[in-house]
């Protein structure tokens, strides 16, 4: 079946911004939003925050939980601001994202 | 070793449609965004658009809207290029190439694939 | 769509010499850009990401700097292989776009 290919421009989203990538700000906008949680020299790593390229969230959301990282999305105005990533109980480890560009 | 393997070169009639592989090896496209590259000879890059084969989303740049349909099945680990309505500035060598969150940019090219139309 | 301004079109080079290329962007990207080395009958080969980055393999002479709308790429120390085109590409924005390309050849 062909695409239907729609010509629109992305829908943004606002989201809660926590975390040192955020500055002074409490929220930010892009096309999707996020809730991380990441293990870093033993600590216990939670942000939050937002995608401006689009792609960039699509990638990142479908790398699966590891040990030391999981990810959670959502698309909608401030939908991660009830969410909370979890690392898996389990499982292998993987080499997840580690060049996130968020500004 | 990661590596993506295109479909031989095509010789098609104006009018006509051509559809392009590429086959991955090395990692599975269902962990990355397969993407599609013009170059006209002596010429610079056009891109195309994606396809994330996990679940068919598709992108496109305006101007292929009409033109490139880019499909994938997972199945064979193959992405497809099908250009319709084919003309002489359609001569090109198209490249695929793949993005995933390593570099968040494309990472690995095929070898390109040339198609020339002409009656 | 995001216009991608490289320049020059064209240099010529002595092996050990340094080169430097721009790419403007016609509005912010902040450092959503990539450098492709393409050699003649072969595909682009990633170079630098994150518009500073080095991809795995990439040899040091090769580096990136910039970010919003000005970027460059320095070859310092140029080696015989290095004599190809140069492509700048953004990635902030669909359509994603190249530069018109800088073709580096030997002097």
């Known amino acids: 079946m062909e695409d239907e290919k729609p010509k629109v421009n992305p829908k943004l989203y606002m989201c809660v911004c926590e975390g040192l990538s955020c500055g002074n700000e409490d929220h930010c906008e892009g096309q999707q939003c996020f809730s991380s949680l990441s293990i870093n020299d033993g600590f216990h790593v939670y942000q939050k925050g937002c995608f401006q390229v689009y792609e960039q969230g699509k990638m990142t959301c479908k790398t699966p939980p590891s040990p030391g990282q999981a990810v959670e999305c959502c698309q909608g105005d401030w939908c991660n601001r009830n969410i909370t990533a979890q690392l898996p109980t389990k499982g292998k480890s993987f080499p997840g994202t580690q060049n996130f560009h968020l500004e | 070793e990661v590596q993506l393997q295109q479909s031989g070169a095509e010789l098609v009639r104006p009018g006509a449609s051509v559809r392009l592989s590429c086959t991955a090896s090395?990692?599975?496209?269902?962990?990355?965004?397969m993407h599609w590259v013009k170059q006209r000879p002596e010429q610079g890059l056009e891109w195309i658009g994606w396809?994330?084969?996990?679940?068919?989303?598709?992108k496109y740049a305006p101007n292929f809207q009409d033109k490139a349909t880019i499909t994938a099945v997972t199945s064979s680990n193959t992405a497809y290029l099908q250009l319709s309505s084919l003309t002489s500035e359609d001569s090109a060598i198209y490249y695929c190439?793949?993005?995933?969150?390593?570099?968040?940019?494309?990472?690995?090219w095929g070898q390109g694939t040339s198609v020339t139309v002409s009656s | 769509d995001i216009q991608m301004t490289q320049s020059p079109a064209s240099q010529s080079a002595s092996l050990g010499e340094s080169v430097t290329f721009t790419c403007l962007a016609s509005?912010?990207?902040?450092?959503?850009l990539a450098w492709y080395q393409q050699k003649p009958g072969k595909s682009p080969q990633l170079l630098i990401y994150?518009?500073?980055s080095l991809a795995d393999g990439v040899p040091s002479r090769f580096s990136g700097s910039g970010s919003g709308t000005k970027f460059s790429f320095k070859i310092s120390s140029l080696q015989a292989e290095d004599f190809a085109s140069y492509y700048c590409?953004?990635?902030?924005?669909?359509?994603?776009?190249f530069g018109g390309g800088t073709k580096l050849e030997i002097k």
């Open positions: 090395g990692f599975n496209i269902k962990d990355s965004l």
């Open positions: 994150a518009a500073t």
């Open positions: 190439a793949r993005y995933t969150s390593d570099y968040y940019t494309m990472d690995y």
């Open positions: 590409q953004q990635l902030y924005s669909t359509p994603w776009t």
């Open positions: 396809i994330d084969p996990e679940d068919g989303e598709t």
């Open positions: 509005q912010t990207i902040g450092t959503w």
